[in-house]
């Protein structure tokens, strides 16, 4: 660490006095102090001498000696007072600029430490400080206004009591600037734009900030547009708005538009795309398969995506049959807008009934015409089974009819004893019928199949069961021969609650 001679923290001299400050270090040393006249500097290796033979009040200040080569960056300081009875203040700067909530140092240095008890800070013309001004004083540095506010941007004077009268410093202008948290906030409206060639369009780029010093511009495909700017102040924010009005758009107006705003903190930008089309358009699509299969009693949502410009003039869901002339309830139709030109329309079909299978069509209209998208809804049913005993071509035959959707598979079981349903332990014989006869198979209806089991002799202490199954479920019917003929046992009634 360098050493200063004289080795005192403060030195008080009179105007016109000779002052010599010597600094000695291990290596080369440098002096730093207030800019003032009459000093001469003499350096000799590891020592440096600062001297004046005519000290003035302007030499008042703190002189610091540093050793540039010292890795620890040590320094020594001495404060010089040049006590001029006519000049109690040495003002180092007449303008101080800080941001709000920073401490503002007004650098009026007292030239005589004895005067410290009678100092005060005032505004020019002897006016008191504004209410709630919190400040402190250091004879070495001056007055500090703590956590300065914008409204404290005033002209100040330092006052000292000398011989019963107040002596003022020259004025110091404090400029307190509002803190800018970051680049301006931006909005670009609309987020997307479509127009038919020849129509009018408007794109609005606006930026806002707590400080008025920021720039905003709108560019089209990297070309900056010359647009008059509107300025405003609202909710304690400055706003600058650029409005691009196009009376008749053409294809060259299409493309990417960027709104860019910048200030000392940086830059923000946001973009949108403008599409110019030859004529109106209306496109319908669905992420779902247009052929839907749903189990009876369950629900289904049919969704259609619409891309259109201009906007829709009408839309509706229609049931095209074949079962009834009922139409979807409007309350089950729902529309959501994804953005300006894309919409999703949903038809909710809860707890589907048999009569609700069929074709559902979504129709939409805009100036580009009508478009439709049709869904085909088939209901799935678990099989329903019935068995009868009959003679075909003179042979005794068990006839099993099963209906459901998808088409049921049929299996015959013969088991010992009389039972409503054969279990594994009782089964004597199993026949699969891979190709039952299809009796009816119409769109949106159940498929009815028939399977024949020719039985030469009915064993009376046995049960014959027809089982049918599909992807939804299974059904069965047990046939029990008795001496007086035959007795059939359907399973528990198939319960259906739509």
């Amino acid at each position: 660490i360098p050493v200063i001679e004289p080795s005192v923290p403060e030195l008080v001299v009179k105007p016109g006095a000779t002052v010599t400050l010597r600094c000695v270090g291990n290596g080369s040393v440098e002096w730093d102090g207030p800019p003032s006249p009459h000093w001469t500097l003499y350096s000799d290796g590891s020592s440096s001498i600062l001297s004046t033979n005519n000290a003035t009040f302007q030499n008042t200040g703190t002189y610091r000696c540093t050793e540039p080569g010292d890795p620890l960056g040590g320094s020594a300081a001495i404060h010089l007072y040049v006590k001029d009875p006519a000049r109690p203040w040495n003002v180092l700067a007449q303008e101080v600029v800080v941001f709000e909530d920073q401490d503002a140092l007004l650098p009026c240095l007292l030239t005589d430490p004895v005067l410290e008890a009678g100092v005060s800070l005032v505004r020019v013309r002897g006016r008191p400080l504004m209410r709630h001004t919190n400040y402190s004083f250091s004879p070495w540095h001056g007055f500090t206004i703590h956590r300065a506010k914008f409204i404290q941007s005033q002209d100040y004077q330092c006052s000292a009591l000398m011989g019963g009268r107040k002596v003022m410093s020259i004025s110091i202008r404090l400029k307190v600037q509002k803190v800018i948290p970051g680049p301006p906030a931006l909005t670009l409206v609309p987020a997307e734009l479509v127009r038919i060639r020849g129509e009018a369009a408007q794109i609005v780029c606006s930026a806002s900030s707590v400080d008025v010093n920021f720039d905003v511009f709108l560019q089209h495909n990297n070309t900056k547009l010359a647009i008059p700017q509107q300025s405003d102040f609202h909710n304690n924010r400055y706003q600058k708005v650029l409005t691009l009005n196009l009376d008749q758009v053409d294809f060259q107006h299409a493309g990417n538009y960027s709104c860019v705003a910048s200030n000392v903190q940086g830059k923000h930008s946001t973009s949108m795309f403008f599409r110019v089309v030859e004529s109106a358009y209306l496109n319908l699509s669905s992420e779902q398969n247009l052929i839907q299969e749903v189990t009876v009693g369950e629900g289904l949502n049919l969704k259609v995506m619409v891309e259109a410009y201009p906007g829709l003039q009408g839309f509706n869901w229609t049931y095209l049959g074949p079962f009834s002339d009922h139409q979807p309830e409007p309350k089950l139709a729902n529309a959501t807008t994804k953005d300006t030109y894309r919409h999703t329309f949903t038809l909710s079909l809860p707890r589907l009934k048999p009569s609700e299978a069929g074709r559902y069509s979504f129709l939409a209209r805009n100036p580009g015409g009508w478009r439709a998208l049709t869904f085909e809804l088939t209901l799935r049913y678990p099989p329903e089974v019935s068995v009868i005993w009959t003679f075909i071509n003179g042979s005794g035959t068990l006839l099993c009819a099963a209906s459901g959707y998808p088409q049921p598979n049929v299996t015959w079981l013969q088991c010992s004893g009389h039972t409503d349903r054969c279990d594994e332990a009782q089964v004597l014989q199993v026949w699969d019928d891979p190709y039952p006869e299809v009796l009816s198979q119409e769109p949106f209806h159940k498929v009815t199949v028939q399977s024949l089991l020719t039985v030469e002799t009915l064993e009376h202490n046995q049960t014959y069961e027809c089982r049918a199954h599909n992807s939804v479920g299974s059904g069965s019917w047990a046939f029990i021969p008795i001496s007086a003929g035959a007795h059939t046992h359907p399973p528990d009634e198939f319960l259906f609650t739509p």
Epitope: V124, R125, G126, R127, P128, L129, M130, R131, F150, I151, Q152, S153, Q154, D155, R173, L174, K175, V176, N236
Partner: antibody
Framework: QVQLQESGPGLVKPSQTLSLTCTVS??????????WSWIRQHPGKGLEWIGY???????YYNPSLKSRLTISVDTSKHQFSLRLSSVTSADTAVYYC????????????WGQGTLVTVSS | EIVLTQSPDFQSVTPKEKVTITCRAS??????LHWYQQTPDQSPKLLIN???QSFSGVPSRFSGSGSGTDFTLTINSLEAEDAATYYC?????????FGPGTKVDIK
Amino acid sequence: QVQLQESGPGLVKPSQTLSLTCTVSGGSISSGGYYWSWIRQHPGKGLEWIGYISYSGDTYYNPSLKSRLTISVDTSKHQFSLRLSSVTSADTAVYYCASLDLYGDYFDYWGQGTLVTVSS
Amino acid sequence: EIVLTQSPDFQSVTPKEKVTITCRASQYIGSSLHWYQQTPDQSPKLLINYVSQSFSGVPSRFSGSGSGTDFTLTINSLEAEDAATYYCHQSSSLPFTFGPGTKVDIK
């Protein structure tokens, strides 16, 4: 809340002295928080600051009127006064007294104003 | 002396509309700018002090902004009672000066 009331003649002859008094109520004229001010408004025109005085008698005058202007204060009567000498028709105006917040530098309370016409 | 200029001189506005009045100082005045409202045959009333501080009892539709030399008074959603002349005033240096005023009337 401070209230101010101007009083004085509404008609003054050219070359004479215009004298107005402002009476302060609802607050002390001796409180250090205010400078007591005079402002005038020529007919159909804007506002012109004339000058102000502190309760202790320190004055600040508009340089354009300084040579003809005297503002004084009488704390015992809660009044301050304006004297403008050698008036001409250009001094015809509505004269307002107002309180200047010393900490804030703005005119927060105003009298209702009195029209003074300079005419022979 | 510091000269204050105001624009516009006159503005005719429909109720609920926004009004913006600007005041420019011939030199730096920091935050020492105040706004007054004077309705016909009345004395001026303080609206805003130190650029943006609302004086007590002033409706929130009045707001101020600016710094240095350029300042703005904004009346959001004008009401019939706001028909008046608006003056800016600087207290940065003597002599105190006022702007020439902006007259706002209702269409």
